[in-house]
Interface confidence: low
């Protein structure tokens, strides 16, 4: 009795395997292996067994172990099964555009691969299996016909082979063809809907929206938007089977007048178009004039607003009397008017629509400098060694510079936290100075010693 181990082996093409041949008797007359494969005996063996390494196994083979024992000669075969994955898995090209509702035939060719009994060919839509067939013939050709629906647009169809060796080597080898993407389409007979401003101002931005329902597949639709000779660059938002193209448009003085706005939606090899008229106008902002933008307090100031000859203006919310393109009023400047805004609003009618423009100017009032008791107290009494912050605020426009000095040299640290010492006591002369002049004020600091508390 001759034994062989392992009795069955599955191995990759070109691989190697160790095979043990053994005899049932202790001292066989002969023990060996017959095989066309390259073999190498692995030494040392035993009295009644030998180990061989078979290499470069390219195809299925049945090496035979033989032994000659006193009770007779016998042999045993090991079954070597070679596996290799297909060399080519290819899906035939799909039509460029496929009408919804028509059947599509998928065809896959597979070259090579073994063992064929474990090789399955699948036609896939994405990862969904459409058909599973055995690989027959060389090359193996597998076909299936599938109905095409809307949900097939953009779907990837591919062909996959599975060499399932899991019962043997716990491995599943997959080869997948390059995917082919299917395109289907449906364009409705209705024209797109176009929403845009009827009037558009020179050098300003307007928004144009073009939309269309009943499109399929909406993601493949292309939109062309143009105003006169100007091509627009829309941002497209997709719904279930609708799209909306939104674009900003800016026009120049050369385009003033009426222009054609065109929206075209293209899908497959068809187009639907809509046209609309847009009036382009020029309307400069009104002018707001002050007799002087910067005046001293008490000065009289004239505020004047002037706009487009056909416009009507309002100055600080008060309409011109009589209504027209010009308005004005007079005021006496006070410190409270410093930074005050004067706003002029102009309204113009263009192609039946009212358009508005605003302009604002600011008045600067020069005043001061000032040093008031409220903001710069004349007397402070603080305990010695306490933490205090001397405060003195000067007012004016332009903002005055403030210095407080004792005996012309010792500064009072305005706005800083200090520890009160005897040195701080005394009378300080605070001086606020700006380009408009200067004011002074005396500030007395009294320090209470602990012994007087």
């Amino acid at each position: 009795q001759t034994s062989v181990f392992p009795p069955e082996v599955i191995l990759p093409r070109g691989g190697s395997v160790k095979v043990n041949c053994s005899a049932s008797c202790d001292q066989p007359i002969s023990l060996g292996m017959e095989t066309p494969l390259p073999k190498k005996e692995i030494l040392p063996g035993g009295n009644n067994w030998k180990m061989y390494e078979l290499s470069n196994v390219q195809e299925d083979s049945q090496p035979m172990c033989y032994s000659n024992c006193p009770d007779g000669q016998s042999s045993a075969k090991t079954l070597l099964t070679v596996y290799w994955t297909p060399e080519r898995v290819e899906l035939a090209p799909l039509p460029p555009w496929q009408p919804v509702g028509k059947n599509l035939t998928l065809r896959c060719q597979v070259e090579g691969g073994a063992p064929r009994a474990n090789l399955t060919v699948m036609l896939l839509r994405g990862e969904k299996e459409l058909s599973r067939q055995s690989a027959v013939g060389e090359p193996a050709e597998v076909t299936t016909t599938v109905p095409v629906g809307r949900d097939d647009h953009g779907a990837n169809f591919s062909c996959r082979t599975e060499l399932d060796l899991r019962p043997y080597v716990l491995k599943l080898f997959e080869n997948t063809s390059a995917p082919h993407q299917l395109q289907t389409f449906d364009l409705p007979a209705t024209p797109p809907q176009l929403v845009s401003p009827q009037v558009l101002e020179v050098d300003t931005q307007g928004t144009v929206v073009c939309s269309l329902d009943g499109l399929f597949p909406v993601s493949e639709a292309q939109v062309s938007l143009a105003l006169g000779d100007q091509k627009l660059n829309p941002t497209i938002t997709y719904g279930n089977n609708s799209l909306s193209a939104k674009a900003s448009v800016k026009v120049t003085a050369e385009e003033e007048g009426t222009q054609q706005l065109l929206c075209g939606v293209m899908l497959g090899n068809q187009t639907q178009e809509t046209r609309q008229t847009v009036t382009i106008y020029s309307f400069p902002a009104p002018n707001v004039n002050l007799t002087k933008p910067e005046v001293s307090e008490g000065t009289e100031v004239i505020v004047e607003c002037e706009a487009h000859p056909r416009a009507k203006v309002m100055l600080n919310g008060v309409p011109a009397q009589p209504p027209g393109p010009r308005a004005q009023f007079l005021l006496k400047a006070t410190p409270e008017d410093n930074g005050r805004s004067f706003s002029c609003s102009a309204t113009l009618e263009v192609a039946g629509q009212l358009v508005h423009k605003n302009q604002t100017r600011e008045l600067r009032v020069l005043y001061g400098p000032r040093l008031d008791e409220k903001d710069c107290p004349g007397n402070w009494t603080w305990p010695e060694n306490s933490q205090q912050t001397p405060m003195c605020q000067a007012w004016g426009n332009p903002l005055p510079q403030l210095k407080c000095l004792k005996d012309g040299t010792f500064p009072l640290p305005i706005g800083q936290s200090v520890t009160v010492t005897r040195d701080l006591e005394g009378t300080y002369l605070c001086q606020a100075r700006s380009t408009r002049g200067e004011v002074t004020r005396e500030v007395t600091v009294n320090v209470l010693s602990p012994r007087y508390e």
Partner: antibody, heavy 118, light 111 residues
Framework: QSLEESGGRLVTPGTPLTLTCTVS????????MSWVRQAPGKGLEYIGW?????SAYYANWAKGRFTISKTSTTVDLKITSPTTEDTATYFC???????????????WGPGTLVTVSS | AFELTQTPSSVEAAVGGTVTIKCQAS??????LSWYQQKPGQPPKLLIY???TLASGVSSRFKGSGSGTEFTLTISDLESADAATYYC?????????????FGGGTEVVVK
């Protein structure tokens, strides 16, 4: 990503019982799914698995006693003719993340208890 | 028939200590071995696969070693949360030989 077993209850010996594992957060078309059981106070016992393509494989001791099947979001384990020895918590588990091995189970359900008693 | 034998069946150690669990296969399974942790009332949790590779999110205090027929799981710097039953599992070969088989388990008690 989660698994949840259901269907565990008290049954009499010989009454077929089907347990269901509901998956969420991943696709059964990409993973092998295993069933493992644990008798009260005992260790884990591997029953079998179903591949992503739907082929079922069983441990030697489990052949003929269990049937594994699946839909797009569930994996079923049918105990064909329960005996008192089948009293256990049954777990479903997902494999296949590491080195493609079905048996490395990196996601488990909480388990469902089956009691077989007359 | 293929078997995985775990020793000891129970082990006790103090917090901060080290525990070693052995798993012996009845035939060579190369490095195709996983380790799982199971706490009462919970499903098992994958700790280690390929004999020594840590699964995602598992503390480096867990260390796996070995190949062929002898495997070891070492837990160092023991924490009270490590109290659980630990199982080894083979994934060599097919389900009818050694694939999927579990060891009998080792209970770790932390003092």
């Amino acid at each position: 990503q989660s698994l949840e077993e259901s269907g565990g209850r008290l049954v009499t010996p010989g009454t077929p019982l089907t347990l269901t594992c509901t998956v969420s957060g991943f696709s059964l078309s990409s993973y092998g799914m295993s069933w493992v059981r644990q008798a009260p106070g005992k260790g884990l016992e591997y029953i079998g698995w179903i591949s992503f393509s739907g082929s079922a494989y069983y441990a030697n001791w489990a052949k003929g006693r269990f049937t594994i099947s699946k839909t797009s979001t569930t994996v079923d384990l049918k105990i064909t003719s329960p005996t008192t020895e089948d009293t256990a918590t049954y777990f479903c588990a997902r494999g296949g993340d590491y080195g493609g091995s079905t048996y490395i189970l990196n996601l488990w359900g909480p388990g469902t208890l089956v009691t077989v008693s007359s | 028939a293929f078997e995985l034998t775990q020793t000891p069946s129970s082990v006790e150690a103090a917090v901060g200590g080290t525990v070693t669990i052995k798993c012996q296969a009845s035939e060579s399974i190369d490095s195709y071995l996983s380790w799982y942790q199971q706490k009462p009332g919970q499903p098992p949790k994958l700790l280690i696969y390929a004999a020594s590779t840590l699964a995602s999110g598992v503390s480096s205090r867990f260390k796996g070693s070995g190949s062929g027929t002898e495997f070891t799981l070492t837990i160092s710097d023991l924490e009270s949360a490590d109290a659980a039953t630990y199982y080894c599992q083979s994934y060599s070969g097919t389900i009818t030989t050694s694939g999927g088989a579990f060891g009998g388990g080792t209970e770790v008690v932390v003092k």
